[in-house]
């Protein structure tokens, strides 16, 4: 027998996710004590079976990693958390139903800036998630969202700033003065779904013009 | 070289099915985003479907919701558009094209579909 | 979906002319904006991409400029070779959409 929370030993029960990895998370309430264990349910979502999360049964921290077990980005699910405590009954908060697709947060993106004399590259990496394909191959965010590009800005002494956007890895800004300091950007967006990450940024200060010296 | 090259294309009488199929080659066929695109005798050029070949994810236009479906096989590098339910209005040249580097800059030659009875 | 309005659906021009087409979008696009040829009977050729940005091996009397929801085509001298369709293509969000075409003919 399991009744709803009304001692405040279970709070705040949620999926958090970034790029695919989801995380279950949890508060223990006023009530809970260094005691207090838990106990992860999960279910996709038109399904009545709970299955048991193996590794978060009578644990005492307060997350379960799901990813895996919630890896199909095209399904919902749904997770419960029951917390016991010495002497009392136990008691049972579920989620919000979870779609890692329309949830996930997007990280920033991973970007070599390499400078040169009078231009700087960026080269963006591609994102792995721990979402497969049917082959077993990693997926990217790319071949996740057919929509995701990326925003490129180059500051320089918060006065002027360049701009590019692509679906493209690699970028360029040219027509740079040589030795200079800049600050790059690059964030990346998927319209459709409205996520946006935060930005990598890279301070790169391109190279000396060098050519004076051998006229 | 970048190829792609369209067949299955013909004549079909309203209501009935047809399944296009592009043979693909010249880059890495098994990590794209792939496309059906029509033209419909002297219009424009609408995007009726698109695939991902690794995760398997697949958009459509609603005009083709429900009737058509793209699908792969990535061990033949052959993309493939099952049309059924098929009405006057899919007569059209049926072409593949694909992104790559970000940009859909290589479409093949076209099939023709005539639905008419 | 976003609808890309094309102008005009036809123009006639002499060699050499200058020669400008119009894209617009009912929503910001941003600079995810291409431009194609297509000559009867051949597949699209992409010329612009970025909506300003010159694909390699075009000819730099083409040109693309605009951002959010207007965006021109600019054929600065039109050589015999120029006259065919010209499509204006938006890849912000699926469905990708066209442009309805612009037929370039001579006068």
């Known amino acids: 027998h399991t009744t709803v929370d009304t001692s405040g030993l279970l709070q705040h029960v949620k999926f958090q996710s970034s790029n695919f990895e989801n995380i279950l998370t949890w508060d223990g309430g006023p009530a809970s004590t260094s005691d207090t264990v838990y106990s992860v349910e999960y279910k996709k979502y038109g399904e009545r079976k709970w299955l048991a999360k193996a590794g978060c049964q009578r644990i005492t921290q307060k997350f379960c990693n799901l990813t895996m077990e919630t890896r199909n980005h095209t399904e919902f699910y749904y997770a419960k958390v029951t917390a016991v405590s010495a002497g009392g009954p136990p008691v049972t908060k579920m989620t919000d139903r979870f779609s890692s697709l329309q949830h996930t947060t997007i990280k920033p993106p991973d970007v070599t800036c390499i400078p040169k004399v009078r231009s700087i590259q960026m080269l963006v990496h591609p994102t792995l998630t721990p979402v497969l394909s049917e082959d077993g191959h990693q997926l990217t965010l790319e071949e996740i969202f057919h929509d995701l590009f990326y925003r490129l800005e180059l500051h320089v002494n918060h006065t002027y700033q360049m701009h590019l956007e692509g679906k493209q890895r690699e970028y360029e800004f040219l027509g740079l003065t040589p030795d200079t300091e800049f600050l790059g950007s690059i964030t990346i967006l998927t319209p459709i779904l409205s996520k946006e990450s935060a930005p990598y940024v890279c301070r790169v200060k391109t190279l000396p013009d060098r050519t004076w010296a051998y006229s | 070289e970048v190829q792609l090259v369209e067949s299955g294309g013909g004549l079909v009488q309203p209501g009935g099915s047809l399944r296009l199929s592009c043979a693909a080659s010249?880059?890495?066929?098994?990590?794209?985003?792939m496309y059906w695109v029509r033209q419909a005798p002297g219009k424009g050029l609408e995007f009726v479907s698109v695939?991902?070949?690794?995760?398997?994810?697949?958009h459509y236009v609603e005009s083709v919701k429900g009737r058509f479906t793209i699908s792969t096989d990535n061990a033949k590098n052959t993309l493939f558009l099952q049309m059924n339910s098929l009405k006057s209005e899919d007569t059209a040249v049926y072409y593949c094209?694909?992104?790559?580097?970000?940009?859909?800059?290589?479409w093949g030659q076209g099939t023709q579909v005539t639905v008419s009875s | 979906d976003i609808v890309m309005t094309q102008s005009p659906s036809s123009l006639s021009a002499s060699l050499g002319d200058r020669v400008t087409i119009t894209c617009q979008a009912t929503?910001?696009?941003?600079?995810?904006l291409s431009w194609y040829q297509q000559k009867p009977g051949q597949t699209p050729k992409l010329l612009v991409y970025?909506?300003?940005r010159l694909q390699t091996g075009v000819p730099s009397r083409f040109s693309g400029t605009g951002s959010g929801t207007k965006f021109t085509l600019t054929i600065s001298g039109v050589e015999a070779e120029d006259l065919a369709s010209y499509f204006c293509?938006?890849?912000?969000?699926?469905?990708?959409?066209f442009g309805q075409g612009t037929k370039v003919e001579l006068k």
């Open positions: 094209a694909t992104r790559i580097q970000g940009l859909i800059d290589y």
């Open positions: 010249g880059f890495t066929f098994s990590s794209s985003w």
């Open positions: 695939i991902n070949t690794r995760s398997g994810i697949t």
């Open positions: 929503q910001s696009i941003s600079t995810f």
């Open positions: 970025g909506a300003s």
């Open positions: 293509l938006q890849d912000y969000s699926w469905p990708l959409t």
